[in-house]
């Protein structure tokens, strides 16, 4: 590591946590535009997923997101080979992702549709512990437009525990979004897609480098939260969004003041969904532990608009609709740290329970 870089990393200190979030709750129901992506399956199998925005493509469960609703400048072109053996991928060509990385055709992929009535209440899922996420303005952090998303690279020292002996360190965070009139979250709840979604990617402390953890069960863990519209501006997100104009071009990278990363997440870290899936972009490595929070984070309409129109991607196309279609569960159970299945049903039902090792 070059000298001078170590000087860019400092010890985080404590600060205030976030506010301005909302519960998903039973009011989050499918609309006509966002129909559930899975019907009730026969014999407990997950059927192919078909809906108005993500049409089924062959039998891989991989959808092509070049939709009629996509704006003129969205990334709608298919993945291509550039000079020098350059394998590239795009959100408009997800059918080609397995050619870029075979793992993208795996059985346990992400994102998924979270069907509340099918979640399994798991009492052993404890509130997440975040340590050192409240960063000081110095040292500064790298904010970049990598052509697929906006990414904030995080310094060492942000620690997270999924449970006893399951410790992770945060590597980076990034966002997924749609357009001004089309939502762009990756995960969906009862078929409902949210305006946007934040992912904070973590590496297990059992590994020193990311490449060692790829494909290893529990090697990576992602904290995900839905972004939703509200009248109030979110001051924590403004610290990111106010810099997007500076990185509008693909490949741009700037330094911005450190910020409170925990303020970008919901304040309630106790109510969440948990499942094992994959990276949502190539190489689509599996074994990723996903935690999707029940509480949403609120941004103003102007902020969501800024997110969806500020960045540009490959071939002078707007960086929009950068989400992968939901993937089949293929027998996976989504666990909930709270009785979400009860909340979602108008009448009492048998509450699924989670499994622990040895059951």
């Amino acid at each position: 590591q070059p000298q001078g870089l170590s000087g860019m990393q400092g010890e985080p200190s404590l600060g205030d946590s976030s506010s301005g979030e909302d519960e998903l709750g039973v009011d989050v129901l499918p609309s006509e535009e966002d129909a559930p992506e899975e019907a009730d399956p026969p014999d407990g199998e997950d059927p192919p997923e078909v809906n108005s925005e993500d049409r089924m493509e062959e039998s891989l469960g991989l959808e092509d997101l070049s939709t009629p609703e996509a704006p003129e400048h969205s990334q709608g072109s298919h993945g291509d080979e550039k000079g020098g053996g350059h394998s590239h991928w795009s959100y408009g060509g997800t059918l080609l992702w397995p050619q870029v990385s075979p793992a993208c055709a795996g059985r346990f992929q992400s994102p998924v549709d979270i069907r509340l009535e099918r979640t399994a209440f798991c009492r052993t899922l404890q509130p997440l512990e975040l340590l050192g996420y409240e960063l000081q303005p110095l040292p500064e952090l790298s904010l970049s437009n990598n052509g697929h998303t906006v990414q904030l690279t995080l310094p060492p020292g942000l620690k997270m525990a999924l449970g006893p002996g399951q410790e992770y360190r945060a590597l980076q965070l990034h966002l997924h979004w749609g357009t001004s009139d089309h939502p762009g979250s990756e995960h969906t709840v009862n078929g409902h897609r949210f305006p946007a979604e934040i992912h904070v990617v973590h590496l297990s402390t059992a590994f020193s480098e990311l490449h060692e953890a790829l494909g290893r069960p529990g090697g990576l863990a992602v904290l995900a939260a839905f972004l939703q519209e509200s009248p109030e501006e979110n001051s924590a997100y403004e610290q990111l969004l106010s810099h997007l104009e500076e990185i509008s071009e693909e490949g741009s990278k700037i330094e911005i003041p450190g910020l409170d990363v925990s303020a970008l997440l919901p304040s309630d870290l106790s109510r969440y969904y948990r499942y094992e899936g994959s990276l949502t972009t190539p190489p689509c490595s599996q074994g990723v532990i996903w935690t999707v929070f029940n509480e949403t984070v609120k941004l103003s309409a102007k902020q969501l608009h800024t997110l969806s129109v500020s960045l540009w991607g490959p071939r002078d196309s707007r960086l929009q609709l950068n989400f992968r279609a939901t993937q089949p569960l293929n027998g996976r159970t989504i666990e909930a740290s709270f009785p979400a299945a009860e909340d979602s049903s108008p009448e009492p039902v048998h509450v699924n329970s989670c499994f622990t090792a040895g059951d």
């Epitope: 990598n146 480098e209 071009e249 490949g251 190489p283």
Partner: nanobody, 117 residues
Framework: QVQLVESGGGLVQPGGSLRLSCSAS???????????MAWYRQAPGKGLELVAV???????QYSSSVKGRFTISRDNSKKTLYLQMNSLRAEDTAVYYC????????WGQGTQVTVSS
């Protein structure tokens, strides 16, 4: 062990050219195609400066001080990053570092470029 190994540095006269290479080995080969790659440099007594970036899609960005003189490129089949440096100036003297940005930063050990008559 992940390794990014730079080569091609050396002593060159003002106005001359050099081509730097950065080869990925070990685990770095697995993530090379998906990483945004970059060249940074550090002049004596100065901080780290971002010189050029190339994304996984091939998009490029350059610092204003090298725009029009330097060209960044990559060959994913060879897992190699390049920096073609033309019209070199004394102020380009620095240690040049290769960087791979894929969820975390991977760094090479650096190669010295000295521009002097």
């Amino acid at each position: 062990q992940v390794q990014l190994v730079e080569s091609g540095g050396g002593l060159v006269q003002p106005g001359g050219s050099l081509r730097l290479s950065c080869s990925a080995s070990g685990g770095a080969r697995n993530i090379f195609s998906f990483a945004a790659m970059a060249w940074y440099r550090q002049a004596p007594g100065k901080g780290l400066e971002l010189v050029a970036v190339i994304t996984s899609a091939g998009g490029t960005q350059y610092s204003s001080s090298v725009k029009g003189r330097f060209t960044i490129s990559r060959d994913n089949s060879k897992k190699t990053l390049y920096l073609q440096m033309n019209s070199l100036r004394a102020e380009d003297t620095a240690v040049y570092y290769c960087n791979a940005d894929y969820y975390q930063d991977y760094w090479g050990q650096g190669t010295q470029v000295t521009v002097s008559s």
